[in-house]
């Protein structure tokens, strides 16, 4: 019989229900915005905004300072007071819409939903390792702002994204706001604008450049700004918006908008459609060609990538890549395929596509029928003409007007659909050693830290744990402070180490020591942990073998048994070749001689499953007693593997030595031609791995084997005669003298 070890699913080596407690702060209300600051003198802070309040926390998440940002009209509103005696507008709560650092000063800038969306500047005052906010400055000049022209009206109640860029001695705020007709009518916020902060912090310079959704489209065409960032020579905004000005406004897609970070002007404003798809390896009948589209961006983050992912993306290590989590629609509801997919867009390729698109619009010969696009911002026109004009005038350049690049940039899910039912609500990507890790928050309040790699059929988890018991969604914005990431969920801010919260979710020594180096995992006798958790026994260099099962569970006291051991950490090498003298198996007092691996039996083990097999020949010593005993495997002097060496002993109980007894044989005669069905009765007849019934030295073919009975068919006899009949178990004869008589046919 060819018994094989049962497969152990890869998932059995980890437990994602392990509870991790990470430092947290209760903000006292739903967290609306969060940003971190790290100074060059070891001072750092976390700024957390909730309705009507701004908290300043130290790096340990202890409260350092708190500031009242509303309600507007309330005498206790600290920021309102900075604008001098009121009234400044209708009273009401302040929901923080913008919270950004101006690195040049350095200062924190907060803008809220009240007071026409104005902003406040808070100088940072380092005090030891903590940071305090100076009294806020009101970035609003009453005499410069009118309802139809308001350079100091920044935040929209519908949502605003801001990226601050230093240009020379000035700070420029790149602002993108969601609008509707009502918001647009109130102190005229703009969709996209670049505003220079005045040196005296009295507001923003008038005459700023801006683009806005045209009044006729405001009702039906809404743009959600999901993310903004600055890298290289550009600032980028990511949007979710209707795919067409004229068609169904619920048919959404994702765009990247690119603005120059070196020139505060919008002539080179460019947009590009980002297309993210799930393309299963085996396409279902009826599934769309090229994969299932996931048009709606939920969260995004850009980061330089590690060597491994860079190679897979065919880019250089350290190059900036935009990662986005996409869903099928606004509700992100389930359809066919996963709930969330992750696509990677190398920034260099995005820029190349945009640059080529500009040339395509502007070069000669003209590409007929190519539209400039962005008809929600500007009058329709064909390339190379400026918006609303029939032709270029001699002193205008085609390149100095906003443009929608005619191609989209398409990518497929990095995770091959493996996120499955998970709904990702937050994303931050880091590079650790040469590994790129996606830190993702989920709809049900969990954190997944997963290596970003392609072409695997399973996820490589750093961790997967619940932030708390509330199960509330993790919010979109994530901040980094040193070696920690800050996630918000409900009214809490959580501090999660980028190396993972711990190692206890790895259940086996092998899985523990195969964990990424940056996690700092080691084995502590019977659990995986970091050195601080078990300084006494912590080590990273070896694992004992682990026996999980063996076969058979019994063997004859006399005669040999081929024993198959199952478990892990037997070899560390796929070939399973064992150097001489490294593996010692004993069953009770008896040695079990290692057998060379039969290469014809080697099966490729998918990485999702793991099991190792070891075979040995058990020949009990004369002193061995009948009865139950233990199986012990000791491995010593093994050459080290890639992650660790195998060293130690594993013991498993449950083996029994037995003495087979033959009590009866019938019939005791049969035809010379053979074929008589012999029944041998006794005890422990099925022990071990081999048995043979011999009639005159020739094997009687076994038809059935059980503990108390053997059935076999006699071989042909040479002559009519009485011949010896014997039973061997494990090659040793079972006591008893029996004969079988061959008769004439």
């Amino acid at each position: 019989e060819d018994w094989q070890c049962p497969r152990t699913p890869y998932a059995a080596s980890r437990d994602f229900d392990v509870k991790y407690v990470v430092p947290s702060f209760s903000a006292g209300g739903l967290v609306q915005a969060m940003v971190t600051y790290e100074g060059d003198r070891n001072e750092s802070a976390v700024f957390v905004a909730i309705r009507n309040r701004l908290h300043v926390l130290g790096p340990d998440l202890k409260s350092v300072q708190s500031l009242a940002t509303g309600p507007a009209g309330d005498p206790g509103c600290q920021t309102c007071a900075a604008c001098g005696p009121g009234p400044h507008g209708p009273p009401g709560d302040t929901d923080t819409k913008v919270l950004v650092l101006d690195p040049a000063l350095p200062a924190l800038v907060s803008c809220g939903s009240s007071l026409q969306g104005r902003c406040f500047l808070h100088d940072l005052e380092p005090q030891g390792t903590a940071v305090h906010l100076a009294a806020p400055a009101c970035l609003f000049s009453a005499h410069h702002n009118r309802p139809d022209d308001c350079p100091d009206c920044v935040a929209s109640p519908l949502g605003t994204r801001v990226t601050v860029v230093e240009q020379g001695q000035a700070s420029y705020f790149y602002v993108a706001s969601s609008l509707d007709a009502a918001v647009a009518a109130s102190f005229s916020p703009r969709s996209v604008s670049i505003r220079r902060l005045k040196a005296d912090a009295s507001g923003f310079a008038p005459g700023f450049v801006a683009l806005s959704v045209l009044p006729k489209h405001l009702v039906s065409y809404s743009i959600e700004y999901v993310h903004s960032f600055h890298t290289g020579a550009f600032v980028y905004f990511l949007t979710v918006q209707p795919a067409s000005v004229t068609d169904d406004p619920s048919a959404l897609h994702t765009r990247l908008a690119r603005l120059s970070a070196t020139e505060p002007e919008l002539g080179d404003y460019r947009e590009l459609v980002l297309d993210c798809r799930f393309a299963p390896k085996r396409r279902r009948r009826g599934a769309p060609e090229g994969g299932q589209p996931y048009p709606v961006l939920r969260v995004a983050h850009s980061a330089p990538v590690g060597a491994q992912l860079a190679t897979e993306l065919s880019i250089a290590e350290g190059q900036e890549v935009l990662f986005g989590v996409f869903v099928t629609g606004k509700d992100g509801g389930p359809g066919v395929g996963p709930n969330s997919v992750v696509c990677a867009f190398p920034i260099d390729l995005l820029d190349t596509l945009i640059d080529e698109g500009v040339e395509r619009c502007c070069e000669s010969p003209v590409h007929p029928g190519l539209r400039r696009g962005l008809d929600f911002f500007q009058s329709p026109s064909f390339c190379p003409n400026p918006p609303g004009l029939e032709a270029l005038s001699p002193n205008t350049s085609c390149r100095h007007f906003p443009l929608l690049v005619s191609s989209s940039f398409s990518r497929v899910d990095l995770f091959n659909g493996l996120l499955g039912p998970v709904q990702v609500t937050a994303l931050y990507v880091t590079r650790l050693d040469n590994v790129t890790v996606a830190h993702m928050g989920t709809m049900d309040g969990r954190i997944l830290q997963v290596e970003l790699v392609r072409s695997l059929n399973y996820l490589l988890y750093v961790s997967n744990f619940s932030l708390g018991d509330s199960g509330q969604p993790v919010q979109r914005d994530v901040s980094r402070l040193g070696d920690h990431l800050l996630f918000a969920s409900g009214d809490q801010v959580f501090q999660v180490p980028i190396q993972g919260p711990g190692c206890r979710h790895f259940l086996t020594c092998g899985r523990c020591l195969r964990a990424w180096h940056f996690m700092g995992c080691g084995w502590c006798g019977n659990m995986c942990g970091q050195q601080k958790e078990c300084p006494g026994s912590w080590q990273q260099d070896h694992c004992p073998p682990k026996l999980t099962e063996f076969h058979p569970h019994s063997g004859p006291l006399r005669g040999s048994t081929r024993l198959t051991l199952c478990g892990s950490n037997f070899y560390l090498h796929p070939s399973g070749l064992v150097p001489e003298g490294t593996h010692q198996v004993t069953v009770g007092q008896s040695p079990c001689r290692p057998l060379p691996k039969d290469s014809s039996k080697l099966r490729p083990v998918p990485r999702k499953d793991f099991v190792e097999e070891f075979e040995c020949e058990l020949e009990p010593l004369g002193t061995q007693a009948v009865g139950p005993t233990n199986v012990s495997l000791t491995v010593t002097n093994m050459p080290p593997g890639k992650h660790f060496r195998v060293d130690g002993t594993s013991v498993l109980r449950g083996f029994s030595f037995m003495e087979p007894v033959l009590i009866a044989v019938q019939p005791l005669f049969g035809p010379r031609a053979g074929g008589t069905c012999l029944t041998l009765e006794g005890q422990s007849l099925s022990v071990g791995t081999s048995r043979a019934v011999l009639v005159n030295g020739t094997e009687c073919l076994l038809a059935r084997v059980s503990e108390g009975q053997l059935l076999c068919a006699t071989p042909p006899g040479a002559t009519v005669a009485s011949v010896p009949l014997s039973l061997q178990v494990g090659g040793a004869q079972v006591p008893g003298s029996w004969t079988f008589q061959y008769r004439e046919d």
Partner: antibody, heavy 117, light 108 residues
Framework: QVQLVESGGGLVQPGGSLRLSCAAS????????MSWVRQAPGKGLEWVSY????????YYADSVKGRFTISRDNSKNTLYLQMNSLRAEDTAVYYC??????????WGQGTLVTVSS | DIVLTQSPATLSLSPGERATLSCRAS???????LGWYQQKPGQAPRLLIY???NRATGVPARFSGSGSGTDFTLTISSLEPEDFATYYC?????????FGQGTKVEIK
């Protein structure tokens, strides 16, 4: 008008090196990806290498990986292909071509590289 | 690598006839990252079609591209004398980018 002019081809012994250049004019060079494509005598086209507009992304065909290096100097509007450890099977006309996302829309006239002892 | 197989290897037709050239990919060329090129003896290739179905600037309307996934077609609705040449398909979705082996359209 767009022009791409290759140079640097010639006869070289197996194991030798050559550096091909492609001078570009008539368009904004630093806005375009560029590629090298070759054609052995009497044979079909074979894509050799690609470089993005800002040089941060480069790709190579398996047959030349580790031996050829693509580069560009945007200030000189020039594309290069450094070819080392040349083999007889590298004998071909080498073309430079402009663009990627909308196809390679402009090509040079090619330069012949002959690898022979 | 994506292998592009063109058929037929040679197409013998007369001027005015319709030419249909096929290009089959060994795996799906998603998002239509496929182009068609024309090459005449002693000349550099010329881009005809990009994105599977978009005509390049200056290419006559008698040339059209179609298809998606693994099967793509270049159609010349009515052959002109100057159309007798070799045609290559090219995928630029997956590195390494690859050409088909070519289809020669010759005068019957």
């Amino acid at each position: 008008q767009v022009q791409l002019v290759e140079s640097g081809g010639g006869l070289v012994q197996p194991g030798g090196s050559l550096r091909l250049s492609c001078a570009a004019s008539g368009f904004t060079f630093n806005s375009y990806s560029m590629s090298w494509v070759r054609q052995a005598p009497g044979k079909g086209l074979e894509w050799v290498s690609y470089i993005s507009s800002r040089s941060s992304t480069t790709y190579y065909a398996d047959s030349v990986k580790g031996r050829f290096t693509i580069s560009r100097d945007n200030s000189k509007n020039t594309l290069y292909l450094q070819m080392n450890s040349l083999r007889a099977e590298d004998t071909a006309v080498y073309y430079c071509a402009r663009g990627y996302f909308h196809g390679m829309d402009y090509w040079g006239q090619g330069t012949l590289v002959t690898v022979s002892s | 690598d994506i292998v592009l197989t063109q058929s037929p290897a040679t197409l013998s037709l007369s001027p005015g006839e319709r030419a249909t050239l096929s290009c089959r990919a060994s795996q799906s060329v998603s998002f239509d990252y496929l182009g068609w090129y024309q090459q005449k003896p002693g000349q550099a290739p010329r881009l005809l079609i990009y994105g599977a179905s978009n005509r390049a600037t200056g290419v006559p309307a008698r040339f059209s591209g179609s298809g998606s996934g693994t099967d793509f077609t270049l159609t010349i609705s009515s052959l002109e004398p100057e159309d007798f040449a070799t045609y290559y398909c090219f995928q630029y979705l997956i590195v390494p980018f690859t050409f088909g082996q070519g289809t020669k359209v010759e005068i019957k």
